[in-house]
């Protein structure tokens, strides 16, 4: 169902933790005092905080942190990861019997853990699979018409256009927009071969299509993926979006009357993965050495020799499947209708140990530990914790997006954060994170509290870490939460600088994972501790741990970007005054809210709820109200995709400087006006009631 983006950030290195930056949302980071914990009971105790107030609060947070740590120490993560990699659950393509069987296992485990409530959502969605009879095929067509078979690949790309094409074959490196722009030859009317990595399959195909290629072959080259097995098969999908592409923008519950429609993110050209051995066979018929700057192995060649063509046949077929999303909730004691969602993909095309096994194992263990903490250790989260096991993640976060689509109008008022556990353990060297800026302060404090599983040093090593955070990308389940639903989301991993080579392949097994990461249990424990501390801080504290002040710097850097184009804007007879004013209003609204919080009576549940409600709306209001969620599902002006985004506005201005004839001034005027009003809307939402809002604007 939705449109596309990829994940990561660095914090790296050694040393001990340092002090973190402040920020609006960090005020309530330390847990409650005894009096606060009693707030809202029959006779609330109201105390003025004394000198020892901070110490008492810290103690309680330390208590919870210690409890979590003790539980983590006695948890066998690898046992569960291994169990999920047994043939009883492998392979578990979405909607299959083994996927459903694992869903039932997760559901039963949630019940055994005595969660407050366990339930399931069922969706009927369309995926694309290989035809059971006709084979996908790559062939070299010689000048005399003879066919030289290259491969009938075991892997495939879901949502490819099922068709047959023939033409010249050219290499386009990773298939990024920049790669295509820098090619010395045209791809128009040709098939392109690209290597996996850097961007998603969907983006590669969309880029190739925009440069008029007629088909795409994707392979894993030896440099980026140093895998011994040259014949290793690869799977992925090419939907430039998330969710069921045949019910774009609306949920596919069985009772929905489906209007016949399809996502604009579906490709119009065929795409197929091939093994490295097949790619090398093709290179044997090609000429021209690949540029050194590509940093690619020497077998790489650029263009198919004259008088030869490549024929690609894709016979994939659509299949309607029933998928199950499994949920379990630990109900909050104060605001049960507000919840943090912790989720993981369950399905996998192959064995999926790193792809979905680790995340599902983490999900199960976190549910078990938190339920235990509530039932036995006296943890009383103010807000609820929902644990979600999604299906059809391999086809573009389908299960997660369907859930979001089903509750689009209300979810942002209830779910205030999404924590993604997918691919949380892919290595040991780095800790990387991608998230909404609203979560940066929480992340920083967590990094100062969690030690690296191997070095033993705190994860927080770099005070400048936030500037290196990469945007959430479309292949990350956290992306639709943030960009489609306006719910702050975070995704993180322990990983290497290089890609984990087995994702989406038949070698994504427990055996390979434990071989590459012998300390797997320790690393999984650290990942669970990161997620666990997020959960505690988000559900336990009086104030929501969402740092609304973080968007001030994002807005400021956007204004700086725009300032480079002052002359262009003046030439069009436009002014940035209103945008400055909207940004100023946002800044003032954040300052006012911080003051309101400091002055608020923390034990007054109603006052605190009013403040939290304002904080909760921030992310959602960054969704452009001027575009349809059906046509442009990813409406977030910072993190979404489409002409309504701030980056699209800046790109349009760049175009004016580069090629004024290609510049669309009407579009730009609209972009500027709508961006201004969207930002003003966020400021207004943060300010609270309408009578508190200045309307000099």
């Amino acid at each position: 169902h939705h449109h596309h983006h990829h994940h990561h950030h660095h914090s790296g290195g050694g040393g001990s933790g340092g002090g973190g930056s402040g920020g609006g949302g960090s005020k309530g980071v330390e847990p409650k005092t005894e009096s606060e914990r009693l707030a809202g009971t029959e006779s609330p105790v109201r105390e003025e905080p004394g000198e020892d107030f901070p110490a008492a609060r810290r103690l309680y947070w330390d208590d919870l942190k210690r409890k979590l740590s003790e539980k983590l120490d006695s948890t066998d993560f690898t046992g569960t990861i291994k169990l999920l990699n047994e043939n009883s659950y492998v392979p578990r393509e979405a909607g299959s019997q083994k996927d459903e069987n694992l869903a039932l296992y997760v559901e039963n485990q949630f019940r055994e853990f005595k969660l407050s409530k366990v339930w399931r959502d069922q969706h009927f969605v369309k995926i694309q699979v290989k035809d059971s009879i006709g084979q996908n095929m790559v062939t070299i067509v010689q000048s005399n018409g003879n066919l030289d078979p290259v491969e009938s690949p075991e892997g495939y790309v879901a949502f490819s256009k099922p068709t047959e094409v023939s033409g010249k074959l050219v290499h386009a490196n990773f298939g990024t927009k920049k790669d295509f722009e820098e090619l010395s030859y045209s791809v128009n009317g040709s098939l392109v071969i690209v290597r996996a990595g850097e961007i998603t399959f969907a983006e590669k195909v969309a880029n190739a299509q925009s440069f008029n290629a007629i088909g795409v072959l994707i392979y894993m080259d030896k440099n980026k993926f140093p895998v011994v097995e040259a014949d290793l098969a690869l799977f992925g999908h090419a939907h430039l979006g998330t969710g069921d592409p045949y019910t774009p923008g609306f949920p596919s519950f069985n009772h929905t009357q489906f209007p016949p429609s399809q996502s604009s993110g579906l490709p119009n050209i065929p795409v197929q993965t091939i093994s490295r051995a097949a790619a090398e066979k093709l290179f044997g018929k090609m000429e021209g050495s690949c540029p050194a700057r590509w940093n690619i192995d020497s077998s790489c060649k650029l263009e198919l020799s004259q008088n030869q063509n490549v024929k690609l046949i894709v016979k994939n077929v659509l299949k309607e499947i029933k998928i199950l999303n499994i949920f379990g909730v630990i109900k909050g004691f104060v605001e049960p209708d507000h919840y943090v969602v912790v989720g993981a993909q369950r399905d996998a095309w192959g064995p999926g140990a790193a792809k979905s096994g680790v995340g599902t194992a983490l999900l199960l263990k976190l549910a078990q530990m938190f339920s235990d903490m509530v039932l036995k250790d006296g943890f009383q989260p103010s807000r609820s914790i929902i644990f979600a096991s999604w299906s059809a993640g391999d086809f573009g976060s389908v299960g997660a997006t369907e859930w979001l689509e089903g509750y689009l109008s209300s979810l942002h008022l209830k779910a205030f954060t999404y924590i993604n556990l997918d691919k949380a353990v892919l290595g040991t060297s780095n800790f990387k994170v991608s998230a909404s800026p609203l979560l940066y302060t929480l992340i920083e404090k967590t990094m100062q509290n969690v030690k690296h599983p191997v070095t033993g040093q705190f994860l927080y090593q770099d005070s400048n870490w936030a500037s290196k955070v990469e945007k959430l990308t479309l292949d990350n389940a956290a992306f639709p939460f943030l960009a489609y639903s306006g719910i702050p989301a975070v995704s993180f991993c322990f990983c290497e600088d290089t890609d984990y080579p087995y994702l989406g392949t038949t070698m994504d097994t427990y055996k390979e994972l434990i071989e590459r990461i012998p300390e797997l249990n320790k690393v999984a424990r650290a990942a669970a501790e990161v997620a666990g501390q997020f959960v505690i801080k988000l559900t336990h504290d009086v104030e929501l741990n969402l740092d609304y002040e973080m968007y001030n710097s994002k807005l400021l850097s956007f204004m700086k970007d725009l300032n480079q184009f002052k002359t262009d804007i003046r030439d069009m007879g436009l002014s940035l005054q209103w945008l400055y004013s909207a940004r100023g209003d946002y800044f003032r609204a954040t300052s006012r809210l911080t003051t309101d919080f400091h002055n608020a009576e923390k034990t007054n549940r109603f006052v605190m709820r009013e403040i939290n409600d304002r904080i909760m709306k921030v992310e959602y209001h960054f969704l452009s109200p001027y575009v349809s969620p059906r046509e442009s599902p990813f409406r977030h002006i910072f993190w979404g995709s489409g002409s309504h985004t701030l980056s699209a506005l800046v790109e349009n201005l760049k175009l004016r400087q580069k090629n004024i004839t290609a510049f669309n001034e009407t579009l730009f005027r609209n972009q500027l006006a709508l961006a201004t009003w969207t930002i003003q809307g966020v400021a207004n939402a943060l300010s609270g009631d309408i009578w508190n809002i200045d309307n000099e604007f």
Partner: antibody, heavy 121, light 113 residues
Framework: EVQLQQFGAELVKPGTSVKISCKAS????????MDWVKQGHGKGLEWIGD????????SYSQKFKGKATLTVDKSSSTAYMELRSLTSEDTAVYYC??????????????WGAGTTVTVSS | DIVMSQSPSSLAVSVGEKVTMSCKSS????????????LAWYRQKPGQSPKLLIY???TRESGVPDRFTGSGSGTDFTLTISSVKAEDLAVYSC?????????FGGGTKLEIK
């Protein structure tokens, strides 16, 4: 013709291990799981476990975890089962059988002739 | 684990007679998504390895004579031999492949009078 070839008999001492083989022919080895089934003298059939030769993933019946280890050699299309810490209880005929590997559970359409393992001092 | 129970444990019939044997599972073997029953029947002649007769509870394996019929759904299944031949002397076992661990019934021994 699809065949699973097993070798007749093994006489082994208690406390030792034995590794029995099953050579597949006539089909694509990696398209099917290899299952192993035990049959004690005059007794019923007991499923031990299976291995997916494509992924090298396994599943074992709880009873045989720690007792049996399944492996494959793709280059020779041969599956192996090693039984360790043998006792008289392990005296039985062991069959290999194939079941389709995939997202669904499957029946055993081809069986080997069986290997008789006798544990005796 | 799913428990499979077969009855009778043995029976003796004359050539040409019709015979039925039963197999019950401790839980349903019907998978709702494809409406299939995950039950197979095998025949094991003396001194031989088992051979597949019926899968999906009622589908005959190719080469199996049509005197063999599988029926039933959910938890109750039956194997019927419409007219017994001398070569049918064997042990007949049912097996569930609905979920791991796969389990077999104790078998029904068919003897010829």
């Amino acid at each position: 013709e699809v065949q699973l070839q097993q070798f007749g008999a093994e006489l082994v001492k208690p406390g030792t291990s034995v590794k029995i083989s099953c050579k597949a022919s006539g089909y694509t080895f990696t398209d099917y799981n290899m299952d192993w089934v035990k049959q004690g003298h005059g007794k019923g059939l007991e499923w031990i476990g299976d291995i997916n030769p494509n992924y090298d993933t396994t599943s074992y019946s709880q009873k045989f975890k720690g007792k049996a280890t399944l492996t494959v050699d793709k280059s020779s299309s041969t599956a192996y089962m090693e039984l360790r810490s043998l006792t008289s209880e392990d005296t039985a005929v062991y069959y290999c059988a194939r079941s389709e590997a995939g997202n669904y559970y499957w029946y055993f359409d081809v069986w080997g002739a069986g290997t008789t393992v006798t544990v005796s001092s | 684990d799913i428990v499979m129970s077969q009855s009778p444990s043995s029976l003796a019939v004359s050539v040409g007679e019709k015979v039925t044997m039963s197999c019950k599972s401790s839980q349903s073997l019907l998978y709702s998504s494809n409406r299939k029953n995950y039950l197979a029947w095998y025949r094991q002649k003396p001194g031989q390895s088992p051979k597949l007769l019926i899968y999906w509870a009622s589908t005959r394996e190719s080469g199996v004579p049509d005197r063999f019929t599988g029926s039933g759904s959910g938890t109750d299944f039956t194997l019927t031999i419409s007219s017994v031949k001398a070569e049918d002397l064997a042990v007949y076992s049912c097996q569930q492949y609905y979920n791991y661990p796969y389990t077999f019934g104790g078998g029904t021994k068919l003897e010829i009078k």
